[in-house]
């Protein structure tokens, strides 16, 4: 599996480095984490564990987006 | 209404190059990726590029790499196909498409160009 | 690569007529299937996608079934406007791949 890799990028531009996922069962995880008045973070990976899960803060929220498609 | 038109076809020696357009329109150009697509005279469907919506990453079959290049100006909603050291299996319709989304991991090729004809010979 | 093998190849049958193509893969590809009809001289146009879903303003006698490495597009009454090629298509994985198309005639 073919995902897009980074660590706290604020632009998804910055976010097209390419990992290949060998373990199996693995997937493509995307972190979406904005604080309030301030960008939104983005982080990709492969991820073993992924679970689709949103969730809202006092000062911000945070959402995570699992797939399992080239380049997804 | 949603649309993709192709130019730049044309006959062309084996070796040679050419670069193929692709202008968008009713859409929001920047926020997709793109892809060419091109079907032989044989009838078959081949996927020979894609690009990411910025134009940061891109990706082709190895029948392809370091051929063809894919790029795109978002300012001016247009897709490219620069097309080198072309062969005659080269010889093809070439349709410029849109990828959709379903869900996260889910996309097909939702809209296409009518095409453009290239003819190495 | 994954290998998408379609059959048949041409088929030919009468108007009202059910319709099915196969299309299997080398490989497991989940429900990462999509369908497309091409008529002669235009762009393709997708018509199924994610094996089963039907695209918007597509008429509800085509449908789609399978998972894992089998599945079947189905036209369940044929009619003269439906002479074209068919293709399904994979995008579990890199390099996308087609099959190599089902031309369909009338009797």
């Known amino acids: 599996l073919l995902c897009y890799s980074c660590k706290a990028q604020v632009s998804n531009e910055d976010c097209l480095q390419v990992e290949n996922c060998t373990q199996l069962g693995e997937q493509c995880w995307t972190a979406r984490i904005r604080a309030v008045g301030l960008l939104t973070v983005i982080s990709k990976g492969c991820s073993l564990n992924c679970v689709d899960d949103s969730q809202d803060y006092y000062v911000g929220k945070k959402n995570i987006t699992c797939c399992d498609t080239d380049l997804c | 209404q949603v649309k993709l038109q192709e130019s730049g076809g044309g006959l062309v020696q084996p070796g040679g190059s050419l670069k193929l357009s692709c202008v968008a329109s009713?859409?929001?150009?920047?926020?997709?990726?793109m892809s060419w697509v091109r079907r032989t005279p044989e009838k078959r469907l081949e996927w020979v590029a894609y690009?990411?919506?910025?134009?940061?990453?891109?990706y082709y079959p190895d029948t392809i790499k370091g051929r063809f290049t894919i790029s795109r100006d978002n300012a001016k909603n247009t897709l490219f196909l620069e097309m080198s050291s072309l062969k005659s299996e080269d010889t093809a319709m070439y349709y410029c498409?849109?990828?959709?989304?379903?869900?996260?991991?889910?996309?097909?090729?939702?809209?296409w160009g009518a095409g453009t004809s290239v003819t190495v010979s | 690569d994954i290998q998408m093998t379609q059959s048949p190849s041409s088929l030919s049958a009468s108007v009202g007529d059910r319709v099915t193509i196969t299309c299997r893969t080398s490989?497991?590809?989940?429900?990462?299937l999509n369908w497309y009809q091409q008529k002669p001289g235009k762009a393709p146009k997708l018509l199924i996608y994610?094996?089963?879903k039907l695209n918007s303003g597509v008429p509800s006698r085509f449908s789609g079934s399978g998972s894992g490495t089998d599945f079947t597009f189905t036209i369940s009454s044929l009619q003269p406007e439906d002479i074209a090629t068919y293709y399904c298509?994979?995008?579990?994985?890199?390099?996308?791949?087609f099959g190599g198309g089902t031309k369909v005639e009338i009797k």
């Open positions: 490989q497991d590809i989940s429900n990462y």
């Open positions: 994610y094996t089963l």
């Open positions: 498409t849109r990828r959709m989304y379903y869900g996260n991991s889910h996309w097909y090729f939702d809209v």
């Open positions: 298509q994979q995008s579990k994985t890199l390099p996308w791949t």
């Open positions: 690009i990411h919506n910025g134009g940061g990453h891109t």
């Open positions: 009713g859409f929001t150009f920047s926020s997709y990726t």
